[in-house]
Amino acid sequence: RTRSGSQLDGGLVLFSHRGTLDGGFRFRLSDGEHTSPGHFFRVTAQKQVLLSLKGSQTLTVCPGSVQPLSSQTLRASSSAGTDPQLLLYRVVRGPQLGRLFHAQQDSTGEALVNFTQAEVYAGNILYEHEMPPEPFWEAHDTLELQLSSPPARDVAATLAVAVSFEAACPQRPSHLWKNKGLWVPEGQRARITVAALDASNLLASVPSPQRSEHDVLFQVTQFPSRGQLLVSEEPLHAGQPHFLQSQLAAGQLVYAHGGGGTQQDGFHFRAHLQGPAGASVAGPQTSEAFAITVRDVNERPPQPQASVPLRLTRGSRAPISRAQLSVVDPDSAPGEIEYEVQRAPHNGFLSLVGGGLGPVTRFTQADVDSGRLAFVANGSSVAGIFQLSMSDGASPPLPMSLAVDILPSAIEVQLRAPLEVPQALGRSSLSQQQLRVVSDREEPEAAYRLIQGPQYGHLLVGGRPTSAFSQFQIDQGEVVFAFTNSSSSHDHFRVLALARGVNASAVVNVTVRALLHVWAGGPWPQGATLRLDPTVLDAGELANRTDSVPRFRLLEGPRHGRVVRVPRARTEPGGSQLVEQFTQQDLEDGRLGLEVGRPEGRAPGPAGDSLTLELWAQGVPPAVASLDFATEPYNAARPYSVALLSVPEAARTEAGKPESSTPTGEPGPMASSPEPAVAKGGFLSFLEANMFS
């Protein structure tokens, strides 16, 4: 049975497997004139591997917390018992309400793109919910994943994430948007505002159009023992134990301390959603306690001091000193100043000498001062911040932060491409293609200093020469190289890059991109002279932009042939002259020819050649450009896409008729050659290229 190349290329020829796993078919190839000897196309069939997904595919996350994906959530397997390392998930659409990251990498910048089932089993794939500014009761997120493990067919999976205040959360004991407690000076009053107690997330369970007529009712179930609660100056008591979220929001709830000591106080309450005018609604409810800390009025609160980030390399350990954590507190001993970790980064943990191997969440200033507190870096290379709260036990806790920078062991400046400056502009912005610093990750905070300036130009930021700039400025397109001297087509400069305490140098090459249109067209005939005109080389746009006549200088080539100036008319004496320089005007006047030579010392056939030119114009830097072209033995039957000024002698002789030749010096007809009728790419082309000698 016969099949055509176009059928193969169109995917219309199918192989249907039946029988043994190894086999194939024999075939011959013919172009209508020639037939190749027989060939065998081997086919090996593989047993179909099927992927399957088990697990709930739902993840319940506490608001603002990090939750690992587990095998209960996501469990893939294959019919071939594939190693979990080879079961790959690709994140097609990431989460909207948080981020997915790897415990070991903690890519704070870039989203996790793929992970394996083995990493899920290890608990290394984490979902972190980011608290929105607006309160909510329950929010839903989805992750669209694609499970793949060649040769099995991919399987799409959706992981549903439910973020809910209803869930019991060890990290967040309150079900309310805020329940932070209150600090009040002894014997004084303090307003309890929504900054300390806020149940507006219960209200968020009501659709917004109806929300204004709903409220949250708080019922005090245990009153403060050392003070009194007042709403709009009216005391709350067993007979009137209620207040509303709307009153709280209006600043009407006050705690008045009765004096006589600084013991802890507080109250217990139930809170539930209520409908308009207090009617019943099926909304959330919670029972909680609100802590009130009474502090000595004479107490001077501790003053945190400026903190220097801790810097250390990946996987190492470094002590934390007063440079990182210190406070000024004249009436507290270092042992009385307590720190509590509110939120730890993913790049390591704090540990106390003699306090076991695990992470610590509470320590004192005395631990810092004595050098007992250290940070242990894990494999992550990402900077992180500890959110701490510090208190002397009598003043309200103050938020503090400790920044930890993980230093790379080495950095590399990646230079993907030289900087190309458009010829007519004479200036161009640097980008990540020219300068980008990587260590074990990208370094977006890198800074650069010029250690060897360019010879023919300047580096500018904001229009002013500069010798220092940042990666951020590069990424924003603010760093510009501008030629100040129009005598060279290239330049270079050397920079020293600094990222997270490590440096490296690199040379950036600058080249001028010629404003030149080059059209080589199809293959050109060997032994012929073809006209070089604006259809082949055109610097007309450069001429317009610079208001000058661009000049070309031949730097190199062609290897087989030469560029010549052709006589203006048949009557003009003398043959063609060798040319090393010419102008745009010469091209437009049709005064130039390219004699295409034959490669010597080998059988006639297709070949490649090129011209390298330097293009000059007034007031702009020169540029180097090349004209690459293919050549082939002259074929009289073929229409060429350029004007031929002469054809090879042999071809004229063979034709036998003088009128069949185009006389030297007279342009031939411009024939626009169609593409050769050869199938492009595909199976047939592969066979043609490889099986016919």
Partner: antibody
């Protein structure tokens, strides 16, 4: 202490309108809903509707829809209830009541409205 | 609308006696989310406005004597007066505050034997 003082008794002709006022004192006026409840002679209590003095939002019992209008004046901490197209069966004592949640913790002294030709 | 039905309509009792008044709602007034029964009891004496005694079916309002107690859940509720005093002679109303329109029972009149 909390007080709700209502306007005095009125006699109205059938088809006329009446407007009873309820002035609040001793608490934050905008914090609490005001309800209107009426009681015909020798009869039980009948809820008419509520107004939220903070937002001005209202909710009326279906029976009075289209005939009743509740308004408030926050500058004088007063709530008004207007009932139009009066009939003899509208003869009743009209009470305003302050609600803490949806129960009525404080009541006005009542306003007797007599509808008679 | 939720219909509230009280029984009996009137009750003749002796002073010092224990008295119970029943109230039935046509549908449940229990909010299962917060486990509250949205039912209140009021006392009304002639020529006076009603006075709140009990809310949420069993919570006594401030200043109400502890001889008054409320019980029940869902649709069936009871007001109990432990030892009837002369000042307790009045008409008693139950009210659902579960959903609008808030509705009252027809009332139970207490008289002395």
């Amino acid at each position: 202490q909390v007080q709700l003082v209502q306007s005095g008794a009125e006699v109205k002709r059938p088809g006329a309108s009446m407007k009873v006022s309820c002035k609040a004192s001793g608490y934050t006026f905008t914090n609490y809903y005001i309800h209107w409840v009426r009681q015909a002679p020798g009869q039980g209590l009948e809820w008419m509707g509520w107004i939220n003095p903070n937002s001005g939002a209202t909710n009326y019992a279906q029976k009075f829809q289209g005939r009743v209008t509740m308004t408030r004046d926050t500058s004088t901490s007063t709530v008004y209830m207007e009932l139009s197209s009066l009939r003899s069966e509208d003869t009743a004592v009209y009470y305003c009541a302050k609600s803490w949640v949806s129960w009525f913790a404080s009541w006005g002294q009542g306003t007797l409205v007599t509808v008679s030709s | 609308d939720i219909v509230m039905t009280q029984s009996p309509d009137s009750l003749t009792v002796s002073l010092g006696e224990r008295t119970t008044i029943n109230c039935k709602s046509s549908q449940s007034v229990l909010n299962s989310k917060n486990n509250r029964n949205y039912l209140a009891w009021y006392q009304q004496k002639p020529g006076q406005p009603p006075k709140l005694l009990i809310y949420w079916a069993s919570t006594r309002e401030s200043g109400v004597p502890d001889r008054f107690s409320g019980s029940g859940s869902g649709t069936d509720f009871t007001l109990t007066i432990d030892s009837l005093q002369p000042e307790d002679i009045a008409t008693y109303y139950c009210q659902q505050h579960y959903s609008t329109p808030f509705t009252f029972g027809q009332g139970t009149r207490l008289e002395i034997k």
